[in-house]
């Protein structure tokens, strides 16, 4: 069984301000078990954008039905994009751990660029 990989197929995405950004991510395996999280930026200061396990993320919707037991598509949509949303977004797979889940694999990242609305 090949080790799980996290695939972010788009190196960059350009979205007009006020529109919706789609950030694509798939996993190549269902195992090991553990949640997916999306972050903007890398390192200790990264910003949590979406957590499969818990939390309220009103601007974020998932592309696929994450309650499907065989789901491997963790793509998200972020609504009402503003220039402040620009940055590199990482899809990160965690494996279950006790007491805390452990980061397992990260996608290569997708750079979101925002085109300002014409004045």
């Amino acid at each position: 069984e090949e080790e799980l990989q996290v695939i972010q197929p788009d190196k960059s995405v350009l979205v007009a301000a006020g529109e919706t950004a789609t950030l694509r991510c798939t996993a190549t395996s269902l195992i090991p078990v553990g949640p997916i999280q999306w972050f903007r930026g890398a390192g200790p200061g990264r910003e949590l954008i979406y957590n499969q396990k818990e939390g309220h993320f009103p601007r974020v919707t998932t592309v696929s039905d994450l309650t499907k037991r065989n789901n491997m598509d963790f793509s998200i949509r972020i609504g009402n994009i503003t220039p402040a949303d620009a940055g590199t977004y990482y899809c990160v797979k965690f494996r279950k751990g006790s007491p805390d889940d452990v980061e397992f694999k990260s996608g290569a990242g997708t750079e979101l660029s925002v085109r300002a609305k014409p004045s």
Epitope: V33, T67, K68
Partner: antibody, heavy 117, light 108 residues
Amino acid sequence: EVQLVESGGGVVQPGGSLRLSCAASGFTFSSNAMSWVRQAPGKGLEWVAGISSGSDTYYGDSVKGRFTISRDNSKNTLYLQMNSLTAEDTAVYYCARETWNHLFDYWGQGTLVTVSS
Amino acid sequence: SYELTQPPSVSVSPGQTARITCSGGAYSSYYYAWYQQKPGQAPVLVIYSDSKRPSGIPERFSGSSSGTTVTLTISGVQAEDEADYYCGGYDQSSYTNPFGGGTKLTVL
């Protein structure tokens, strides 16, 4: 407050059919996966079937081909259609809400199904 | 037959520590939970994701995992903890939810 209320249980003859319902309230039903779990008298718990928010379905081996799980998100209701019933299907049937990782965080009080001639 | 294995009974005196084990699932593809069931009542989730405690469940209930075995620990057992305890899992490799046969906890 999360509430799950099962109905539709009763006595049915072997080979007969029954449809169970589970009315859900207190949470966004359409966003949650749901399952049916049963418990034969004096026995342990047995998972019967599960359904995703988008109606993908999953079944335990003992009911595959005989039972059908479904949902109506507009009515906040979960269903279990049970066909070709046998005495081994006699049990209390619980509906349960699934967590993000398919464990069960809330359970109804159950409805008793008795298969007897 | 049950895919997860747990002892049929455990007895403990009030104030002591009760431990109930459950084994059978591969660590990398399993999540475990523990359910408490009192006579005539529906099961109640007391531990999920191997070791997490839902809000409203007393701190004396804890869960741990080691390899393919998970353990429910009840510290300072009280008379009200007398119940059947079921280990339940989610098996990502088969998309199923196996249960153990249940453990009857008796408070002496």
